[in-house]
């Protein structure tokens, strides 16, 4: 009922609390001696659903019937209106509109640990609109039944706070949930476990990886479990992997050996718990354990390539690279490389520990045959010494293979494609395609790149360490027992018309004609590899086209004659540079008047 | 000193009905266990019913008695009831209320005379046929 009603009654008929669809009867009465002071007839009563006027009767009571309420909570009051008066409110009343519940479904109970406590979760429903209390009863051995009540508006958990204990893990408890409201009753079917079926264990604890001398191939991990365990399941990865490697083990006692891990790769590990072969479920699995293991010595070898380059008539500059080895390979942090220079004839032999770097550079004499051991080590070992004989590598002019070509593949890459060379193409055992930025000067501090090439292959895709717009210099070498042939070949993979022209820095005269010289264009403004340089001339003032003069780019030319000027005319002169992508803009203008002969 | 002190008990009708109390002094058992247990002539005290004192309190009930009887308790008060429907003349026994010192979590120790370490003096039920 609503306010203290003092003037009269609302009564709902047949209850205040009925199922979706059901008629209620409403009435209002007005209490002796409380209706309009001067004509009671004049009383007229209201009825209001909420605040919307629904009904009204002039007297000392109203009926009425009310249909097609809404699930949910409705409010009705009644007033009275007297004339020349604002409405005074009578009394009112609630009804609330449900459904009787449904049977609640998929009870399941669990215990999470041995210590933990029994709770229950199901599935309630469709919504009552009304107070509905649940009760969950659990029956078990003993003559025993425990039951606790939910009085929550949306319950479908509850925890029963008690602990079953596994003196007979196989004795049955049988769980039931009871949903009750004021339209009726129901109850889920029986849920029948035992203390096997429902306890959970909880994921073990204290996880410890142990490598018995420090060796990856005895390994063992440990941890511990709730007392009852049986079964375990393991799972690990190497920490950059997504797929994990799962075992099974029974009866593991808190330590399991693990015989198939790699050398120095953090892995990760989770360990999950049963109690039964077949009954019940498995824990969470634990919290991870993140572990390095041991190094292994290196296993594989390196990579190793070499270049030579001519001092002067005794001397040699020998520059050595190897590429890093696989983390597979290396099995560990590599500490240092090994290099050994030896003369084969002499026996002489030096040995070096390289830090840092992935090359060495030495001089050695011009004479003897000279040969490289390149290892690298870690701190448990290094791996085998690769072994080259320096010879020359271009030598063998028959061996050279023929018609390289470099093209353009795609984004940062590049097509290397050659012919066997005219020697017996069946005397090449390998051939290694080598590239560097090309660099005026020739600068030996470039780094060097080569990939190696099976003795069938006639063409290599290169695509490390390659950049648009710069040019490469390519050379193909065929390897064959101690000789080696070359080819070389300019390439890049993108290229576009160069951003500057040739600075000229001089002009001089010779003999009659005169002798143009410039300095390179900065490798970041010639966009891709050089074809030509174009050489301008025209009579100053004149407004005729200039003559030009094309000649090929090569790498160390930064000077060319010109003899076709007349003496005693000023010219005006200047350069460009070309790609296969086009013409770059003019490099700056020079005047010259050849002076010719004197007369 | 703590005491417990058991009321309500009588004679009745089979089918009858009965509101035992148990109203707890000297320290407050609001949040531990309380049970009840009777004791027949020339019989061993056997458990009727509890409360676990764990989260919100779970009732429990030996099965011969599931249905019929009801553990409620006011913590407030201190008092503790066993609301009895529908008796038989198997329920005549002398009512024993028992209040612990701790929560009981574990299966079947609420049903345990040892769990319990303060009991009352006793009310007579008799239930005539």
């Known amino acids: 009922k609503i306010d203290a009603c003092k003037r009269g009654d609302v009564t709902v008929k047949p209850s205040h609390v009925i199922l979706l669809g059901s008629t209620v009867n409403i009435t209002c009465s007005l209490k002796p001696r409380q209706g309009c002071f001067h004509y009671s007839r004049r009383n007229k009563l209201i009825l209001y659903k909420f605040d919307r006027r629904i009904n009204f009767h002039h007297g000392h009571s109203l009926n009425s019937q009310v249909t097609g309420l809404p699930l949910g909570t409705t409010l009705f009051v009644c007033k009275l209106a007297c004339i020349n008066s604002d409405e005074i409110q009578i009394c009112g009343a609630e009804i609330f509109v449900g459904v009787a519940p449904e049977q609640p479904q998929n009870l399941s109970c669990i215990q999470k640990g041995e210590q933990g406590t029994v709770a229950c979760t199901w599935e309630r429903g469709r919504d009552t609109h009304l107070y509905t209390e649940y009760t969950l009863q659990l029956s078990g051995p003993k003559n025993l039944t425990w039951q606790k009540q939910c009085k929550d508006i949306y319950c479908d958990y509850l925890d029963f706070g008690i602990n079953l204990t596994p003196e007979s893990p196989e004795s049955n408890f049988t769980a039931k949930v009871t949903a009750v409201n004021s339209l009726g009753s129901s109850s889920s079917l029986p849920s029948t476990f035992t203390f096997l079926d429902i306890v959970r264990p909880l994921p073990p604890w204290d996880i410890r990886i142990k490598f018995q001398k420090a060796s990856v191939s005895r390994c063992t991990l440990y941890w511990r479990d709730e007392g009852l365990v049986l079964l375990n399941r393991l799972r690990y990865r190497p920490s950059n992997s997504r797929l994990w490697n799962m075992v099974n083990v029974t009866k593991a006692k808190g330590r399991h050996d693990l015989l198939d891990l790699k050398p120095f790769t953090e892995y990760e590990f989770q360990i999950s718990s049963k109690l039964h072969l077949y009954k019940g479920s498995w824990s969470d699995w634990s919290e991870s354990l993140r572990a390095q293991t041991p190094e292994e010595e290196p296993t594989g070898m390196l990579d190793v390539w070499y270049m030579k380059r001519h001092i002067d008539y005794s001397r040699q500059q020998i520059s050595l690279f190897w590429k890093n080895l696989s983390v597979s390979e290396a099995r560990g942090k590599i500490l240092h490389y090994q290099v050994t220079l030896q003369e084969l004839t002499g026996g002489k032999a030096m040995t070096q520990n390289i830090t840092g770097h992935t090359s060495w550079t030495t001089v050695i004499p011009r004479t003897g045959n000279w040969a490289v051991a390149v290892s690298a080590a870690n701190s448990k070992g290094s791996s085998l010494p690769t072994r080259i004989n320096i010879m020359n590598l271009c030598e063998a002019g028959l061996l050279a293979p023929r018609q390289v070509s470099a093209n353009s593949e795609g984004m940062d890459n590049i097509l290397v494609t050659w012919q066997p060379p005219r020697k017996d193409p069946s005397a090449v055992q390998e051939y290694v395609v080598e590239w560097r930025e090309l660099h005026p000067g020739g600068d030996t501090q470039v780094p060097l790149n080569w990939l190696r090439s099976r003795p069938y292959n006639v063409s290599a895709l290169i695509s490390e360490n390659i950049k648009s717009y710069i040019c490469y210099e390519i050379r193909v070498y065929a390897l064959s027992g101690d000789q080696g042939g070359c080819s070389s070949i300019l390439g890049n993979s993108k290229h576009k018309a160069p951003l500057s022209g040739p600075h000229i820095n001089a002009i001089t005269e010779e003999k009659g004609s005169i002798l143009i010289s410039w300095n390179s264009i900065p490798v970041q403004e010639q966009m891709g590899c050089l074809l030509h340089y174009r050489i301008y001339w025209k009579e100053r003032d004149s407004n005729s086209q200039p003559q030009l003069c094309e000649i090929p780019y090569r790498v160390s030319q930064n000077s060319h004659p010109i003899n076709s000027l007349q003496p005693r005319v000023t010219y005006v002169l200047w350069m460009t540079a070309l790609t296969a992508a086009g013409e770059s803009s003019h490099g700056n203008e020079r005047e010259f008047c050849l002076q010719g002969k004197a007369n | 000193q703590v005491q417990l002190q058991e009321s309500g008990g009588g004679l009745v009708q089979d089918g009858g009905s009965l509101r035992l109390s148990c109203a707890a002094s000297?320290?407050?058992?609001?949040?531990?266990?309380m049970a009840w247990f009777r004791q027949a002539p020339g019989t061993e005290r056997e458990f009727v019913a509890g409360?676990?004192?764990?989260?919100?309190?779970?009732?429990f009930y030996d099965n011969s008695v599931m249905g019929r009887f009801t553990i409620s308790r006011d913590s407030a008060k201190n008092t503790m009831w066993l609301q009895i429907n529908n008796l038989k003349p198997e329920d005549t026994a002398v009512y024993y209320c028992?209040?612990?010192?701790?929560?009981?979590?574990?299966?079947?120790?609420?049903?345990?005379?040892?769990?319990?370490?303060?009991w009352g003096q006793g009310t007579q039920v008799t239930v005539s046929s």
């Open positions: 028992a209040a612990a010192t701790h929560v009981v979590v574990s299966y079947g120790l609420v049903r345990k005379r040892g769990t319990y370490d303060y």
């Open positions: 000297g320290r407050t058992f609001s949040n531990y266990a």
């Open positions: 409360l676990s004192g764990s989260g919100g309190d779970t009732a």
